[in-house]
């Protein structure tokens, strides 16, 4: 793939990524009702990051929103902290990754900024995509404890009062924002990534990296560490083979002896 | 002004079928949940069916589960009870009315009679 | 199903008089969601549909006197009418609208003396 396709395709799925990041956290379905004891319910109930809702039979819904910081449990703080530090990144990235982007020519900026530019903006996607996966998932962890904890009240509860009046608790489960966050936030992540990996093919070689050559085996190898240019007759899954105690290992056999530092 | 009249109803013997029929008016049909109620001889109120808004959804009692249907047709503003398999205690006056919030049923019809009879 | 039981069966009162009935429901109609409680109550008069009254246990339908107030939580529900008006007189119904199958109180009828 080449590096304008990488970098172009990368900043496509971070910004379906990002928009999903955005959905996830302004939607209201962050947590429904548990249907399995009353699958026919007249009144439904769901909650958001920001407000509850309540759907009714009739068609009426009506919601609410969390108007106190403070009479909020500590960890939807956290996960509204989370997702909104992945919005703020994301945007950020977006902003950046446009001016990087190898299509658009912005005056005389060289391959070696966008290269910069491209790299930042990936590494501002991963950490988006990153709080919005943990941010999702922190939420779902207290959605699994609150429900195990209902179920277990639900249980224990049924015995007082004789059995004649009961009290029917309602349980929560994962909304769909939950589903659209983990899948937004692993897009992000995933354009992120392919952002970074295409930072390596922008790097002009000769700029950054001067040709160095080592007397191995009575041959003169070439050895370049950069990644290759898109110019050079080098198919991207072509390996580098680093000549190692004159010519003695190629990094293949390395690999196979374990060194210290396979082991961090 | 809602209004809302319904017909269909009549003496059938047991074992029988019936079509209930409300003509919805004074409102927008479409945008409400619809419910049918029933009211035995001994004035006892019980719920039969509802529909919801987008037609999706229908809800019964046990009572009449598998041999009640309840349906609606927006474009004719009307709402049906398809009732099948009709028993002696299924006689009662049968009213057509509209959710509103609360799940309250703010508009009732002024009924129509089934007797099921031998 | 949700059992409703309506206390007393029927009511004698005279014009003026400030009138009480209640209605206990065998399972919780109080919502976590809204912290609204889904009991309804109808008004019945002879030859006649029913008409709303009060939806979500306290809140008057609109056209309904002031006379009219409806309390309570949980299971527990009054409907209350301040001063009993001629016109008032006829069987008032409570109903579960929280979870289906929806189910009706036997009712209290109001009579005068």
């Known amino acids: 793939m080449s590096v304008t396709a990488c970098q172009g395709l990368g900043f496509v799925v971070s910004l379906i990524g990002f928009a999903g990041i955005i959905a996830a956290t302004c939607m209201d379905q962050w947590s429904t009702q548990d249907l399995y004891n009353n699958p026919v319910t007249a009144v439904f109930n769901y909650q958001g990051l920001w407000r509850s809702c309540v759907r009714e039979s009739s068609g009426f819904t009506e919601c609410r929103g969390y108007f106190t910081l403070l009479g909020l449990p500590a960890m939807l703080q956290a996960v509204r902290a989370l997702m909104i530090v992945g919005i703020v990144l994301g945007v950020i990235g977006i902003l950046v990754s446009i001016f990087a982007l190898k299509c658009i020519r912005i005056g005389s900026m060289d391959d070696s900024a966008k290269a910069k530019m491209t790299l930042t903006s990936g590494i501002l996607f991963i950490i988006s995509g990153i709080c919005a996966i943990i941010g999702v998932s922190v939420f779902a962890n207290m959605l699994v404890t609150n429900f195990w904890m209902s179920t277990a009240n639900m249980y224990s509860g049924m015995g007082g009062m004789g059995g004649m009046v009961q009290t029917v608790q309602t349980r929560y489960t994962f909304g769909a924002a939950l589903f659209v966050g983990w899948v937004a936030g692993g897009l992000t992540l995933i354009g992120g990534v392919m952002m970074c990996i295409a930072c390596r093919g922008l790097t002009p070689d000769d700029s950054n990296f001067k040709a160095v050559s080592y007397h191995a085996s009575g041959q003169n190898v070439a050895y370049r560490p950069g990644g290759f240019k898109a110019s050079t007759g080098f198919g991207s899954n072509t390996r580098n083979k680093k000549i190692y105690d004159g010519g003695a290992r190629t990094e293949d056999d390395e690999q196979s002896h374990p060194t210290k530092y396979d082991y961090v | 002004d809602v209004k809302l009249v319904e017909s269909g109803g009549g003496l059938v013997k047991p074992g029988g079928s019936l079509k209930l029929s409300c003509a919805a008016s004074g409102f927008t049909f479409t945008s409400y949940t619809m419910s049918w109620v029933r009211q035995t001889p001994e004035k006892r109120l019980e719920w039969v069916a509802t529909i919801i808004i987008g037609g999706s959804y229908t809800y019964y009692p046990d009572s009449v589960k598998g041999r009640f249907t309840i349906s609606r047709d927006n474009a004719k503003n009307t709402l049906y009870l398809q009732m099948s398999s009709l028993k002696s205690e299924d006689t009662a006056m049968y009213y057509c009315?509209?959710?509103?919030?609360?799940?309250?049923?703010?508009?009732w019809g002024q009924g129509t009679s089934v007797t099921v009879s031998s | 199903d949700i059992l409703m039981t309506q206390s007393p069966s029927s009511l004698t009162v005279t014009a003026g008089e400030k009138v009480t009935m209640t209605c206990k429901s065998s399972?919780?109609?109080?919502?976590?969601?809204?912290?609204?409680?889904?009991l309804t109550w109808y008004q019945q008069k002879p030859g006649q549909p029913p008409k709303l009254l009060i939806y979500w246990a306290s809140s008057r339908e609109s056209g309904v006197p002031d006379r009219f107030t409806g309390s309570g939580s949980g299971t527990d529900f009054t409907l209350t009418i301040s001063s009993v008006q001629a016109e008032d007189l006829a069987v008032y119904y409570c109903q579960n609208d929280y979870s289906y199958p929806f189910t009706f109180g036997a009712g209290t009828k109001l009579e005068l003396k």
């Open positions: 009315t509209r959710l509103v919030k609360g799940n309250a049923m703010d508009y």
């Open positions: 399972q919780s109609l109080l919502n976590s969601g809204n912290q609204k409680n889904y």
